[in-house]
Interface confidence: low
């Protein structure tokens, strides 16, 4: 069976939207009105991995683009990147681990933990207009909580 996917946008706990910042980078900033059209629409695919009531493995692709968020080591540090894939082969049920995030729901907020690097989360800065990154701390200065808005396909 084909992998189940849904289209959505994400906003951080400060209500910052995620937008493209160059071909392989996302950043977070407050958008209003028509500018909201600039926010990235994700294709969230439900993939194979460890699952529980509040933890669901997903892959986050960019709608209509052959790009997926992935987690890799750079200079010995877990790093978030946008990775190009062959659209003929993706999405798939058994995604490579670097593409997999554990979607964790807590108090109506979502966290996205890297399956490759446990306890590392998709994060944004408090500051406006800064890159989305992989952070190793929760509850600190950086933001790891998101809300999801469904987008009709």
């Amino acid at each position: 069976a084909p992998v189940r996917s849904l289209h959505c946008t994400l906003r951080d706990a400060q209500l910052k939207s995620l937008v493209m910042s160059g071909p392989y980078e996302l950043k977070a900033l407050h958008l209003q009105g028509q500018d909201l059209e600039q926010q990235v629409v994700f294709s969230m695919s439900f993939v194979q991995g460890e699952e529980s009531n509040d933890k669901i493995p997903v892959a986050l692709g960019l709608k209509a683009k052959n790009l997926y968020l992935s987690c890799v080591l750079k200079d010995d540090k877990p790093t978030l990147q946008l990775e190009s894939v062959d659209p003929k082969n993706y999405p798939k049920k058994k995604m490579e681990k670097r593409f997999v995030f554990n979607k964790i729901e807590i108090n109506n907020k979502l966290e996205f933990e890297s399956a490759q690097f446990p306890n590392w989360y998709i994060s944004t800065s408090q500051a406006e207009n800064m890159p989305v990154f992989l952070g190793g701390t929760r509850g600190g200065q950086d933001i790891t909580d998101f809300t999801m808005q469904f987008v009709s396909s």
Partner: antibody, heavy 121, light 112 residues
Framework: DVQLVESGGGLVQPGGSRKLSCAAS????????MHWVRQAPEKGLEWVAY????????HYADTVKGRFTISRDNPKNTLFLQMTSLRSEDTAMYYC??????????????WGQGTSVTVSS | DIVMSQSPSSLAVSTGEKVTMSCKSS????????????LAWYQQKPGQSPKLLIY???TRESGVPDRFTGSGSGTDFTLTIGSVQAEDLAVYYC????????FGGGTKLEIK
Amino acid sequence: DVQLVESGGGLVQPGGSRKLSCAASGFTFSSFGMHWVRQAPEKGLEWVAYISIGSYTVHYADTVKGRFTISRDNPKNTLFLQMTSLRSEDTAMYYCVRDDYDVTDYTMDYWGQGTSVTVSS
Amino acid sequence: DIVMSQSPSSLAVSTGEKVTMSCKSSQSLLNSRTRKNYLAWYQQKPGQSPKLLIYWASTRESGVPDRFTGSGSGTDFTLTIGSVQAEDLAVYYCKQTYNFPTFGGGTKLEIK
């Protein structure tokens, strides 16, 4: 082909006003942030102002803040720069410039040919 | 504001020669999270509007000849033209895009 055509330049008295226009074609205007950049005679380039796709984010250089207003009309594919309280140091070629990555990366990939503004009595 | 300084202000070379020009910023343009330097180079030929050559310090814009190379990180950057051609006669500007853009004063390249 991307085309940006500026108009509205000319001779203005000090303290006067002028409105520049930029007609865009060859790309989806409403999907790109836009800038005005100026160049005084025999001088370097100076960024003037930026406007986001839906006009909700605007930024100005300190030298023009409070005097210049950037705006856009997406259905008409046109960018504007309203200039007031003009000074001699505003004399320059004014370029309309497209922003490469839509939100505020300020990588300017296409430039118009410019329109010349001279502030003099 | 971030201040950009370019040197030399002008230089004259023969065609076929290699040329380098420098750009220094008053603060680092390296974003440690993205590992990108937010610096671009533009070429302005006489009587023309500027043209984007390089962004992120070293990424060549599509269609730009590979004799143009950008390098550097942090506060010190270099534009190198591997083998100067007559059509490279121009003023070259660096520009930081780390925050509101500021340009360097330019380096004028003349052909002997």
